[in-house]
């Protein structure tokens, strides 16, 4: 058993049929010595008396809010949550496996630049009695500070018969060094509590590996005289790290016809303009990627040829 | 050329070669899915690699103030990785394919380190990998880790030379 926060405790249980469970001793936080009784949740049934209560925790019915009283007055509470371990593996019932970029990916994170700011998100089908708490650091043995906000519900989607809820959190490294080569990964830890079930999820990454620039901005076409060619120009996204002579991007320019089956013409360039042939009903799209490190491409910025 | 005395390197040549290094480092080991092997026991070989750290002066301001600190750090890293790529981790079994980009990568590391420090000039401290023979069964994982680490190192080096070529070239 360990303390998650004040008066909230997590009991770690090996979860299998007829498991013996864990013996837990609760102590009433009071100077009083006698006349103390214990109850669980809203029940008025007295579970025991005395300053301590010993219970055998085997299942969710044994978890919940234990309260000690004296003469009708509440002295203190202890909330017991269960953390299940099945076949040596901690349960992951609360969050959905996003399966990208690999199986058992519950947390996904992205950064728009090298400032040390990043966003993580996760999915669940649970809509009520759900709380999340997020902690983060750079490195684990001698951790350096990363400050995370509160997790918020950021999107709701309907997937077949189910509703899916997306939660996200923003974090910022306290002393970020954008130009340095990271040697210790960022660690993100999410505590998830659904009713009386506790689970924790972790992710470990370098900022450089989760970089995904915003799409290029101000995408414009300039027809060239007496030609089917156009000059496409764009700018670095505002959110990208500066100076651009140091934090450089590379770009992919694509000409795509109306039909998905039509052949796509692609040009790669380090410049912020390119000359392409604009076909009728086609559109021109540009996306960006870090020039020197192959992290994710941005989403496309597009304009119609006409 | 970054002679230890303090003259400027051939920024544009260094920029071109460092960008080629980035391309080679990724073609030598493309990011397969997101094959995250950081958990797989940190061997000394990959722990000891020199990193370009915050105080090394490789940020735009530091380069403006005095690029020598940063260039020395980059040189140190290039020599270190060049030695790693010549070690039995890469020359031993399982053999690299004859057309593997590792050979070109190796030559380019040497080329850039020589651009930074021509024959006959020496920066004092050198960090050299202390390499005990690697067991064949460890080598694929070690190669993966070294190349991932090299990708990060050459990305910073390429930024330094791109910025230098754009803003510090005579």
């Amino acid at each position: 058993i360990w303390e998650l926060k004040k008066d909230v405790y997590v009991v770690e249980l090996d979860w299998y049929p007829d498991a013996p469970g864990e013996m837990v001793v609760l102590t009433c936080d009071t100077p009083e010595e006698d006349g103390i009784t214990w109850t669980l949740d809203q029940s008025s049934e007295v579970l025991g008396s005395g300053k301590t209560l010993t219970i055998q925790v085997k299942e969710f019915g044994d978890a919940g809010q234990y309260t000690c009283h004296k003469g009708g007055e509440v002295l203190s509470h202890s909330l017991l949550l269960l953390h299940k371990k099945e076949d040596g593996i901690w349960s992951t019932d609360i969050l959905k496996d996003q399966k990208e970029p690999k199986n058992k990916t519950f947390l996904r994170c992205e950064a728009k630049n090298y400032s040390g700011r990043f966003t993580c998100w996760w999915l669940t089908t649970i809509s009520t009695d759900l709380t999340f708490s997020v902690k983060s650091s750079r490195g684990s043995s001698d951790p350096q500070g990363v400050t995370c906000g509160a997790a918020t519900l950021s999107a709701e989607r309907v997937r077949g018969d189910n509703k899916e809820y997306e939660y996200s959190v923003e974090c910022q490294e306290d002393s970020a060094c954008p130009a340095a080569e990271e040697s210790l990964p960022i660690e993100v830890m999410v505590d998830a509590v659904h009713k009386l079930k506790y689970e924790n999820y972790t992710s470990s990454f370098f900022i450089r590996d989760i970089i995904k620039p915003d799409p290029p901005k101000n995408l414009q076409l300039k027809p060239l005289k007496n030609s089917r060619q156009v000059e496409v120009s764009w700018e670095y996204p505002d959110t990208w790290s500066t100076p651009h002579s140091y934090f450089s991007l590379t770009f992919c320019v694509q000409v795509q016809g109306k039909s998905k089956r039509e052949k796509k013409d692609r040009v790669f360039t380090d410049k912020t303009s390119a000359t392409v042939i604009c076909r009728k009903n086609a559109s021109i799209s540009v996306r960006a990627q870090d020039r020197y490190y192959s992290s994710s491409w941005s989403e496309w910025a597009s304009v119609p040829c006409s | 050329r970054a002679v230890p005395g303090g003259s400027s390197p051939a920024w544009t040549q260094c920029q071109q070669l460092s960008q080629k290094l980035c391309t080679l480092a990724w073609s030598a080991h493309p990011l397969v899915g997101h094959m995250d092997l950081r958990e797989e026991g940190d061997e000394e070989t990959t722990n000891d690699v020199p990193h370009i750290q915050c105080g090394d002066g490789c940020d735009p301001q530091g380069l403006r103030d005095n690029s020598q600190f940063c260039l020395q750090r980059i040189h140190q890293g290039l020599i270190f990785y060049e030695k790693l790529l010549g070690s039995d981790i890469f020359t031993g079994e399982p053999s690299l394919l004859p057309d593997s980009p590792v050979g070109q990568l190796h030559a380019s590391l040497l080329g850039l380190s020589q651009l930074l420090q021509p024959e006959g000039h020496h920066w004092e401290t050198q960090q050299i990998p202390s390499l005990s023979p690697s067991q064949p069964w460890q080598r694929l994982l070690l190669r993966f880790k070294i190349l991932r680490s090299l990708q990060a190192f050459v990305a910073v080096a390429a930024r330094v030379f791109a910025h230098g070529a754009a803003t510090l070239s005579p």
Epitope: - | K83, G86, S87, D88, T91, G92, E93, P94, S95, L96, G103, L131, P133, Q135, P136, W137
Partner: antibody, heavy 115, light 107 residues
Framework: EVQLQQSGPELVKPGASVKMSCKAS????????MHWVKQKPGQGLEWIGY????????NYNEKFKGKATLTSDKSSSTAYMELSSLTSEDSAVYYC????????WGQGTTLTVSS | DIVMTQSPATLSVTPGDRVSLSCRAS??????LHWYQQKSHESPRLLIK???QSISGIPSRFSGSGSGSEFTLSINSVEPEDVGVYYC?????????FGSGTKLEIK
């Protein structure tokens, strides 16, 4: 075409030393390790050690430490093995071979130690 | 050291027979196992690398299988020129060790 050409047979007296060579051609000498293997008459194969011609790093079978010394010369793409304090137990055919999985072996050097 | 045990020591076969040569490692060597053929007064010749990978120029009748500590070299239709001694080799860890060999004879 990859070839490993080994030096000719040696007849030496007990207590003496011998240095045999293995000249590589048809590939970049510094790209692969060079292993040395011993085979006594009518017996099996025994690994002696390897040299990395790129950096002259060596790795020996504990059994041959102090007996065999591996060196190489990049300029002539040649690997060498010196055997010291020879006894009749050292009489054998000695092979050089680049990385096991490349499948190229020298033709062998026959060493006879006899007074 | 990893001990490589080959069986049988000698195998007498008729041309056209399918034969299996066994090799056992004293501990797991994953698939880091190579097979060699050595004919009288010749250098060893690599037949199979990494337990099952074929080698260019080696007839397709030779194949390898196994992983961990149990390995097999199969010759699916023995030819008279296949006579010789077959060795398996631990390519997993130092010191590299060879089996004592299986001698293949033609009846």
């Amino acid at each position: 075409e990859v070839q490993l050409q080994q030096s000719g047979p040696e007849l030496v007296k007990p207590g003496a030393s011998v240095k045999m060579s293995c000249k590589a051609s048809g590939y970049t000498f510094t790209t692969y390790l060079m292993h040395w293997v011993k085979q006594k008459p009518g017996q099996g194969l025994e690994w002696i050690g390897y040299i990395n011609p790129y950096n002259d790093g060596t790795n020996y079978n504990e059994k041959f430490k102090g007996k065999a010394t591996l060196t190489s010369d990049k300029s002539s793409s040649t690997a060498y093995m010196e055997l010291s304090s020879l006894t009749s137990e050292d009489s054998a055919v000695y092979y050089c071979t680049k990385n096991w999985d490349k499948g190229y072996w020298g033709q062998g050097t026959t060493l006879t130690v006899s007074s | 050291d990893i001990v490589m045990t080959q069986s049988p020591a000698t195998l007498s076969v008729t041309p056209g027979d399918r034969v299996s040569l066994s090799c056992r490692a004293s501990q797991s060597i994953s698939d880091y196992l190579h097979w060699y053929q050595q004919k009288s007064h010749e250098s060893p010749r690599l037949l199979i690398k990494y337990a099952s990978q074929s080698i260019s120029g080696i007839p397709s009748r030779f194949s390898g299988s196994g992983s961990g500590s149990e390995f097999t070299l199969s010759i699916n239709s023995v030819e008279p020129e296949d006579v010789g001694v077959y060795y398996c080799q631990n390519g997993h860890s130092f010191p590299f060790t060879f089996g004592s060999g299986t001698k293949l004879e033609i009846k």
